[in-house]
Amino acid sequence: QPNNSLMLQTSKENHALASSSLCMDEKQITQNYSKVLAEVNTSWPVKMATNAVLCCPPIALRNLIIITWEIILRGQPSCTKAYKKETNETKETNCTDERITWVSRPDQNSDLQIRTVAITHDGYYRCIMVTPDGNFHRGYHLQVLVTPEVTLFQNRNRTAVCKAVAGKPAAHISWIPEGDCATKQEYWSNGTVTVKSTCHWEVHNVSTVTCHVSHLTGNKSLYIELLPVPGAKKSAK
């Protein structure tokens, strides 16, 4: 068992390898065809370590001439994955990440998949479909979400520290009850942020404090009983 003055509680969400997709089935394609084509760009938050499937505009493959996926990742040259129907050939340019692949053969399925999404997959993904009727685009601003690790501990009398470590985007920390708090943010080179909130409670009838961490990947609460003030022996409540 840890000492009360040391780290008392930690939490790290564990995600089974889930899949997320914005793709639609055939029925939806029929209903939403014009709407989807109008909605060219989509912001899409995806949890790290899940699988993601990105879709092209809902164009029947028989009408296709060329499909191109353009992938723009931070600090990388633009990667393109192209499929030409007439010659049944695929071509890749500047694509080095083996986790980003066609879902299956592009003549059967034009979707792109990212296996085990990482922070480095943050970026812009665009499918361009060339047809006799013109070019159709669909873009994704992929925002990779990282669940922060949450810790709560005491470092001195009636002062508690709550940390949300390496979250993306930054988590928000609140307390019950409210205390006299100072919050700092530390930005890491990989795009994650550590938020540290240090609070002091002068009011002596506060027994237990709760740190509530709000994040796009889910919320987490931890609580801790405050240590007594040194020298304080007896108190009637």
Epitope: N3, N4, P177, Y223, K233
Partner: antibody, heavy 114, light 107 residues
């Protein structure tokens, strides 16, 4: 896993005192508040107070102020709750609890009867 | 002191039904709480800690929600063994205070 073992049932006369013990194991005894809660027959739960064994710091509910004394023996990891000037309405099961109320003893029945 | 108003005080429900119990803290003061189950002659058993965390070994039909001053305890599908009295406990402020209890009977 935290275990709290309480002393056995007591029968006392009005005006007497009773001392209930609670021996803790499975956690750092001096680092967690220990609380006492009582429950009269057919009634709800009532918090009496708490003690921090590491410093001896205590909080008593004002209802029991002057009649209750909580102490801790760090050498045996045991806390004590003594209630004096007993009256019939003090007949209750007395529980010790720790780890922010997540671990409870089995309770000690104190019967006050003439 | 923070008063915890728990309702209802009693209810009689059929097996398989959904049960909801609420606790509200007085003075509009935000608190944190636990939910306990107590059967006759036994110590209270912690079911939900910190308003919404299901304790290890507790069936998933039990759940807790809410924050601030209003909290809800739910049994999604009542089982015969759930007949008991249920209490909330606020542990943010001294003195700690319990709700008055909800006695749950099976029809």
């Amino acid at each position: 896993q935290v275990q709290l073992v309480q002393s056995g049932a007591e029968v006392k006369k009005p005006g007497a005192s009773v001392k209930v013990s609670c021996k803790a194991s499975g956690h750092t005894f001096t680092s967690y508040w220990m609380h006492w809660v009582r429950q009269a027959p057919g009634q709800g739960l009532e918090w009496m107070g708490n003690i921090y064994p590491g410093s001896g710091s205590i909080n008593y509910d004002e209802k029991f102020q002057g009649r209750v004394t909580m102490t801790a023996d760090t050498s045996t990891s045991t806390v004590y709750m003594e209630l004096s000037s007993l009256r019939s309405e003090d007949t209750a099961v007395y529980y010790c609890l720790t780890m922010t109320g997540t671990s409870w003893g089995r309770g000690t029945l104190v019967t006050v009867s003439s | 002191d923070i008063q915890m108003t728990q309702s209802p005080s009693s209810l009689s429900v059929s097996v398989g039904d959904r049960v909801t119990i609420t606790c509200q803290a007085s003075q509009g003061t935000p608190i944190n709480l636990h939910w306990f189950q107590q059967k006759p002659g036994k110590a209270p058993k912690l079911l939900i800690s910190g308003a919404s965390n299901l304790e290890s070994g507790v069936p998933s039909r039990f759940s807790g929600s809410g924050s601030g001053t209003e909290f809800t305890f739910t049994i999604s599908s009542l089982q015969p063994e759930d007949a008991a009295t249920y209490y909330c406990l606020q542990f943010t402020y001294i003195p700690w205070t319990f709700g008055q209890g909800t006695k749950l009977e099976i029809k």
